[in-house]
């Protein structure tokens, strides 16, 4: 997260880190005791999932292995549409005040809605500085029409943009797959943006979760 702030401790109990060994690979969101939602481009052979702590590499955090993941069947490595994936945990999480599932959206929030994005991604770009604490940034949803002025045809129909005019605050390397939460519901998953990160008026681009609720529910049901 560029130009963000340290999240209030325990305020993101659904936030997870997808680790490769002990190294941050992507963010993710707990949606069920067995399931984490993340970006399709975060796919690996297997994952170590850290839950229940704002500190990356926290020894007291829950760590659960995940060996199965299900990309959206329409994910394209060319256009990056449908950049969404479900990761099935090998064992269920122990829910607590520190570990909770996020609320999936009932509807798509409109442009102008205030949201918070979080992650352990680099706080500087292009040179990287990875924080140990979970970082947050407050952003607003931007209309597709406005966002297309920047990204033109790169912006797919199920992509969502968020940012703050003239501000550098944005997501960056390592934040991928992490949550954009608006009015206590998951509205976006970090997908992409311009690079170096934090260029003013280049919004962050997210997978618009409200368009995928049916796929999420059906996939979890199928692979119970």
């Amino acid at each position: 997260i560029i130009d963000g702030y340290k999240c209030k401790e325990g305020s993101h109990p659904w936030q997870v880190a997808l680790l490769k060994g002990n190294q941050l690979h992507c963010g993710g969101v707990l949606v069920d005791k067995y399931w984490v939602l993340t970006a399709a481009h975060c796919k690996m052979g297997q994952y170590q999932v850290q839950l229940g702590s704002d500190k990356i590499g926290d020894q007291s955090a829950q760590k659960i292995k995940a060996t199965k993941s299900f990309r959206h069947p329409g994910y394209s490595t060319k256009t990056h549409v449908n950049d969404i994936m479900l990761v099935r945990l090998d064992e269920p999480v122990k829910m607590s005040s520190k570990v909770e599932a996020v609320q999936l959206p009932e509807h798509c929030e409109p442009p102008g809605t205030s949201c918070t994005v979080s992650g352990w991604g680099t706080t500087t770009s292009p040179d990287v500085t990875f924080p140990s604490d979970l970082m947050c940034s407050d952003v607003k949803l931007i209309s597709s029409r406005e966002c297309k002025k920047v990204y033109k045809d790169l912006l797919g129909k199920t992509m969502l943009c968020a940012g703050i005019p003239d501000s550098k605050t944005n997501t960056c390397n390592g934040d991928s797959g992490g949550p954009l939460v608006c009015n206590d519901t998951l509205q976006g998953l970090v997908s992409w943006g311009t690079y170096p990160c934090g260029q003013p008026n280049d919004p962050g681009v997210y997978t618009q979760v409200c368009k995928y609720k049916r796929w999420v529910m059906e996939t979890m049901k199928t692979h119970r």
Partner: antibody, heavy 122, light 108 residues
Framework: QVQLVQSGAEVKKPGASVKVSCKAS????????IHWVRQAPGQGLEWMGS????????NYAQKLQGRVTMTTDTSTSTAYMELRSLRSDDTAVYYC???????????????WGQGTMVTVSS | DIQMTQSPSSLSASVGDRVTITCRAS??????LNWYQQKPGKAPKLLIY???SLQSGVPSRFSGSGSGTDFTLTISSLQPEDFATYYC??????????FGGGTKVEIK
């Protein structure tokens, strides 16, 4: 030191295969994509394809589809490019390059290997 | 696929000259164009990304401009070490990534 180091020059007969390696150091290999670009003697640059070091996702140039395979070994931070059924017009310097970006998209090549000369001759 | 056309294919110039190279895309690529310098026997080196942003460590005599389909690389005062071949590429509609044919800058 952030670098990509490629394997040495190769001489191959038409119809043979070649496998070029590209070892990354000084950065997190799985965080960026590796692309392969070739340059025939006295010619311009030609994009061959790319691979995501973490997911293994590949995209290949249409003209090379079926003849090229790109792989990675994350345990050694090494990318490989294999080209089969070699022809004389595959004679070129082959470069690996790191694509800079974040998330699903990359925007430019900010780091290149030193190149590997592959000569195809009977 | 988007085609990238560079002009001129070669030019002769003297030290101190202002040199301009152009790159034209077959369709709009917004500002997702990059410029590279390549010297004989060496790998290309990034000069400019995003049409106009100077890569770290690249001298300020290099500048880029343009958006949409027409782009320019300018060397404000040519130095002896600038004699090389220059390439543009586009990362807008990818894959494939497409390169311009190159512009060779030679000593007059």
């Amino acid at each position: 030191q952030v670098q990509l180091v490629q394997s040495g020059a190769e001489v191959k007969k038409p119809g043979a295969s070649v496998k070029v390696s590209c070892k990354a150091s000084g950065y997190t290999f799985t965080s960026e994509g590796i692309h392969w670009v070739r340059q025939a003697p006295g010619q311009g640059l030609e994009w061959m394809g790319s691979i995501s070091a973490s997911s293994g996702d590949t995209n290949y140039a249409q003209k090379l589809q079926g003849r090229v395979t790109m792989t990675t070994d994350t345990s050694t931070s090494t990318a490989y490019m294999e080209l089969r059924s070699l022809r004389s017009d595959d004679t070129a310097v082959y470069y690996c390059a790191r694509a800079a970006g974040y998330g699903a998209r990359s925007w430019y090549f900010d780091l290149w290997g030193q190149g590997t000369m592959v000569t195809v001759s009977s | 696929d988007i085609q990238m056309t560079q002009s001129p294919s070669s030019l002769s110039a003297s030290v101190g000259d202002r040199v301009t190279i152009t790159c034209r895309a077959s369709q709009s690529i917004s500002s997702y164009l990059n410029w590279y310098q390549q010297k004989p026997g060496k790998a290309p080196k990034l000069l400019i990304y995003g049409a106009s942003s100077l890569q770290s460590g690249v001298p300020s005599r290099f500048s880029g401009s343009g958006s949409g389909t027409d782009f320019t690389l300018t060397i404000s005062s040519l130095q002896p070490e600038d004699f090389a071949t220059y390439y543009c590429d586009q990362f807008y509609s990818t894959p494939p990534i497409t390169f311009g044919g190159g512009t060779k800058v030679e000593i007059k």
